[in-house]
Interface confidence: low
């Protein structure tokens, strides 16, 4: 997946640091105090729709087959710049019963972006 | 996630049957001959952006916090109707060396849709 560098307007990954204090979650998240969540931004012209690289799922591949052949309704489906690979991060936090829990939380960090 | 019923134009899951013969994959996929892949369709107005229900990832929730507060650049990010839960299915197929393989293939079936 592309990294946004200010020169491209094609779907790419943009660096973004989330501060848990900013969003008021520092009362239940113990550590870390924030993290590089990143996000996806950019255009998805028809010729790159469904081309989310290594992370392209079976389903995306199938739908893209129909889309490329102009099959209704996929030819008109809006293609979106979305996370195609997310990674896990360890967190220390209070659960509902105020126990301190350490857990690997999935889908925290956007690693790659692609067009749906 | 909503099921599309023809009455709503909000992001929902649409039933769709994929025929492997249709897309020319019946020469390597032995079974099944097709499956209900489904897909996502519909509008994502700002008030439901990031509200993909039970499948809402940590990342989506975080970004939505910023979006709801009008934080640039998220306030202007295009929200998309995308799969938020995909499931696995068993397949019997020929691999690259023409061996018959049975495998659970992830991300084959769209189970739920939501707004990114």
């Amino acid at each position: 997946g592309l990294e946004c560098d200010g020169k491209v307007n094609i779907c790419c990954k943009k660096q973004f640091f989330v501060s848990f204090k900013d969003i008021g979650w520092n009362d239940w998240i113990i550590a870390p105090s924030g993290y590089h969540a990143n996000y996806c931004e950019g255009e998805c012209p028809s010729h790159i729709a469904g081309t989310s690289g290594s992370s392209l799922s079976f389903h995306s591949t199938v739908i893209n087959h129909y889309r490329m052949r102009g099959h209704s309704p996929f030819a008109n489906l809006k293609s979106c710049c979305i996370p195609t690979k997310l990674s896990t991060m360890s967190m220390l936090y209070f659960d509902d019963e105020y126990n301190i829990v350490k857990r690997d939380v999935p889908n925290m960090i956007v690693e790659e972006c692609g067009c749906s | 996630g909503l099921e599309c019923d023809g009455k709503v134009n909000i992001c929902c899951k649409k039933q769709f049957f994929v025929s492997f013969k249709d897309i020319g994959w019946n020469d390597w996929i032995i079974a099944p001959s097709g499956y209900h892949a489904n897909y996502c369709e519909g509008e994502c107005p700002s008030h439901i952006a990031g509200t993909s229900g039970s499948s809402l990832s940590f990342h989506s929730t975080v970004i939505n916090h910023y979006r709801m507060r009008g934080h640039s650049p998220f306030a202007n990010l295009k929200s998309c109707c995308i799969p938020t839960k995909l499931s696995t299915m068993s397949m019997l197929y020929f691999d690259d060396e023409y061996n018959i393989v049975k495998r659970d293939v992830p991300n084959m079936i769209v189970e739920e849709c939501g707004c990114s």
Partner: antibody, heavy 121, light 106 residues
């Protein structure tokens, strides 16, 4: 760089109250995201957590010491204090103050130099 | 109450690798922290959140934590590394320390 320094009497009589103060320099005790802690080490033994306090006054104590411990904070002086009452010889130890790091509870860094308190008549 | 168990002592020759263990029930589900104590000095945090090294701590210090055991590893041990090492974890809202391990560099 934040530094912590313990102060208080080095000798306390049995049954009396042990009082120590930790002065924080190089940073404000009112900064959110830290808990200010007391930890002790008995002679030749391991570390024992006593308790900690937030700048707003929320306290958490070691259950085994809870009935005898009070930790308080004075943001105007950038200090926090420990009071341990009804002391016995078993309370003889080096007492450290430390900052619990993280947005809330996390790891202890930095620590003070420690002060030896002996309980004896 | 929750307990963390460490070996009382570990010996190592200079330049060799020293491993100090810390055991506790499902310790791998918690974060482990390690502190170095030298006589007359302030305790120093050497590893936090299982395997992260604070700035200023040499790269020879590393940590791991899984199952019931956290391990502090010092590779290429130097004479200056001789000290007492304590592991720490959280049990609910309570801090628990191990009994400490005396590292001797022969």
């Amino acid at each position: 760089q934040v530094q912590l320094q313990e102060s208080g009497p080095g000798l306390v009589k049995p049954s009396q109250t042990l009082s120590l103060t930790c002065t924080v320099s190089g940073g404000s005790i009112s900064s959110g995201g830290y808990y200010w802690s007391w930890i002790r080490q008995h002679p030749g033994k391991g570390l024992e957590w006593i308790g900690y306090i937030s700048y707003s006054g929320s306290t958490y104590y070691n259950p085994s010491l809870k009935s005898r411990v009070t930790i308080s904070v004075d943001t105007s002086k950038n200090q926090f204090s420990l009071k341990l009452n009804s002391v016995t010889a078993a309370d003889t130890a080096v007492y450290y103050c430390a900052r619990a790091y993280g947005d809330y509870r996390g790891w202890f860094d930095p620590w003070g130099q420690g002060t030896l308190v002996t309980v004896s008549s | 109450s929750y307990e963390l168990t460490q070996p009382p002592s570990v010996s190592v020759s200079p330049g060799q690798t020293a491993s100090i263990t810390c055991s506790g029930d499902k310790l791998g589900d918690k974060f482990a922290f390690w502190y170095q104590l030298k006589p007359g000095q302030s305790p120093v945090l050497v590893i936090y959140q299982d395997n992260k090294r604070p700035s200023g701590i040499p790269e020879r210090f590393s940590g791991s934590n899984s199952g019931n055991t956290a391990t502090l590893t010092i590779s290429g041990t130097q004479a200056m590394d001789a000290a007492d090492f304590y592991c720490q974890a959280w049990d609910s809202s309570t801090v628990v320390f191990g009994g400490g391990t005396k590292l001797t560099v022969l």
